[in-house]
């Protein structure tokens, strides 16, 4: 069990003026990376 407070979606982070690179540097899990690249694909 367990888990944690789910991270805010990438779009929210961008609103906070975080760069894509700084977001990339924080990714930890496979799911984190999958969501990140899904967002990048969707923003093209």
């Amino acid at each position: 069990g367990g888990g944690g407070s789910k991270h805010k979606c990438v779009q929210n982070s961008l609103v906070n003026n975080e760069t894509l690179e700084s977001i990339m540097n924080t990714l930890e899990s496979e799911e984190d990376f999958r969501k990140y690249f899904y967002y990048l694909e969707g923003s093209k």
Epitope: S29, E30, E31
Partner: antibody
């Protein structure tokens, strides 16, 4: 069930090196980032380092940067902490810990392994 | 770095007491706060995540609240097994940082 079993602690002289291991089971180890946290005798908890899925991202506390290296071997489901140029202030119990991803809390911890740096 | 300040650093309480521990972040961390319990010679045990969500298997006598910079952990009715040290931790950003701990002792 999730298990994180640590090994590699011991007594080492200042300036020498030591490698800690954390063997994981009960979950898809390769899919998750892993952390090291330490606790000096009688003191509080201090975050040390993190390694992401695939080893893509690594971050360290300022106190160990340039001396410690975090790594992983997904084929062995094992996390490592290579500690070089050890100092007396590195004496602590070291814990490995797992969380689901960035901005998630730790859900599982290893049992801890004591590193004593002394001449 | 985000500093986490816990208070009190220690407290004495009796079985059955309601105990509250506070944790303050030096800057806003939304609800990215966890609480851990640690007994001597043991690894920390995760109690609460997301400031107020109970980890699986943790009894409901533990509760957490707060958001932004101010947080609390409450034990509604202290039991003998609850005498331990409690730590808060922010996981909003690297480096992850912990409070200094609160030791809950028997009065």
């Amino acid at each position: 069930q999730v298990q994180l079993v640590q090994s590699g602690g011991g007594v080492v002289q200042p300036g020498r090196s030591l490698r800690l291991s954390c063997a994981a089971s009960g979950f898809s180890f390769s899919s998750f980032g892993m952390h090291w946290v330490r606790q000096a005798p009688g003191k509080g908890l201090e975050w040390v380092a993190v390694i992401s899925y695939g080893g893509i991202n690594k971050h360290y506390s300022d106190s160990v940067k340039g001396r410690f290296t975090i790594s992983r071997d997904d084929s062995k489901n094992t996390l490592y902490l290579q500690m070089n140029s050890l100092r007396a202030e590195d004496t602590a119990v070291y814990y490995c810990a797992k969380r689901e991803g960035y901005r998630y809390a730790y859900d599982y911890w290893g049992q801890g392994t004591l590193v004593t740096v002394s001449s | 770095d985000i500093q986490m300040t816990q208070s009190p650093s220690s407290l004495s309480a009796s079985v059955g007491d309601r105990v509250t521990i506070t944790c303050r972040a030096s800057q806003g961390i939304s609800n990215y706060l966890a609480w851990f319990q640690q007994k001597p010679g043991k690894a920390p045990k995760s109690l609460i995540y997301g400031a107020s969500s109970l980890q699986s298997g943790v009894p409901s006598k533990f509760s957490g609240s707060g958001s932004g910079t101010d947080f609390t952990l409450t034990i509604s009715s202290l039991q003998p097994e609850d005498f331990a040290t409690y730590y808060c931790q922010q996981y909003n950003s690297y480096p992850l940082t912990f409070g200094g701990g609160t030791k809950v002792e028997i009065k």
